[in-house]
């Protein structure tokens, strides 16, 4: 089965790489614009230059193209704790990231929030914090993992998942209560 091509891909596939088919005359292949530029006017004829103009400040194109407008530069989302790693240039979008000792959590494909890496207090670091993943902690005896923090088993309620990890402690607490009833 031949995959379905969009109109634009169909038009481009008729021309050699680095060229696109003239929208008004499908016998003409025009040279695409370099990254950092956009299409101002199609080439007037075969072998003639495409009129490409440089992107204005605040916009970019990151690859060769025949776009009528440059793309708007992304803005880092301060409300999500993001910081600018590198600013937008005519041929590269803004790069956003997180501060030192933070990691990115992606809520969706194009939205991330910065959170502090867990320090594994009352536990040990099993896996170090990475760009897109929090520290993985292993808790000391008498502690269980809740929301990636090691919490004392004294905070473990019987209905919670922690009961398996804290079972000896819970039994001990029950035992002392029982012994006090004699």
């Amino acid at each position: 089965l031949v995959p379905h091509l969009g109109d634009r891909e169909k038009r481009d596939s008729v021309c050699p790489q680095g060229k696109y088919i003239h929208p008004q005359n499908n016998s003409i292949c025009c040279t695409k614009c370099h990254k950092g530029t956009y299409l101002y006017n199609d080439c007037p004829g075969p072998g003639q230059d495409t009129d490409c103009r440089e992107c204005e400040s605040g916009s970019f194109t990151a690859s060769e193209n025949h776009l009528r407008h440059c793309l708007s530069c992304s803005k880092c989302r301060k409300e999500m704790g993001q910081v600018e790693i590198s600013s937008c240039t005519v041929d590269r979008d803004t790069v956003c990231g997180c501060r030192k000792n933070q990691y990115r959590h992606y809520w969706s494909e194009n939205l991330f929030q910065c959170f502090n890496c867990s320090l594994c207090l009352n536990g040990t670091v099993h896996l170090s914090c990475q760009e897109k993943q929090n520290t993985v902690c292993t808790c000391h005896a008498g502690f269980f993992l809740r929301e990636n923090e090691c919490v004392s088993c004294s905070n473990c309620k019987k209905s919670l998942e922690c009961t398996k990890l804290c079972l000896p402690q819970i039994e001990n607490v029950k035992g002392t209560e029982d012994s006090g009833t004699t």
Epitope: K78, E79, N134, E147, N148
Partner: nanobody
């Protein structure tokens, strides 16, 4: 005690509009970024939109961009979601939430309001 109470959901025809509200109490509303998320039947949570503390910066998922508008009234401690040109795929339970601070989970969110888009 933090409380978030959504309202405004209901049954609407494709192409129709609804305005969701979220009444907040128990915390300083103006100090928090607020979020709308939704859960379609049998699916996971989807981030719909969020708005910064002063209502200046907003974000929309690609699926709702140009159709939904988030806003807030800090004097009324209320968050809104204006939903226009509704589609069948917008059918979901809509929740308002406070943007998490400690980690990627929601400490505070409402009970949700059901939006059904059907002819």
């Amino acid at each position: 005690e933090v409380q978030l109470l959504e309202s405004g959901g209901g049954l609407v025809q494709p192409g129709g509009s609804l305005r969701l509200s979220c009444a907040a109490s128990g915390f300083t509303f103006a100090h928090d970024v607020m979020v709308w998320v939704r859960q379609a039947p049998g699916k996971g949570l989807e981030w719909v939109s969020h708005i910064d503390r002063v209502g200046q910066d907003t974000y929309y998922a690609d699926s709702v961009e140009g159709r939904f508008t988030i806003s807030r009234d800090n004097s009324k401690n209320t968050l809104y979601l204006q939903m226009n040109s509704l589609r069948a795929e917008d059918t979901a339970v809509y929740y308002c939430a406070v943007l998490p601070k400690r980690g990627p989970w929601f400490d505070y969110w409402g009970q949700g309001t059901l939006v059904t888009v059907s002819s």
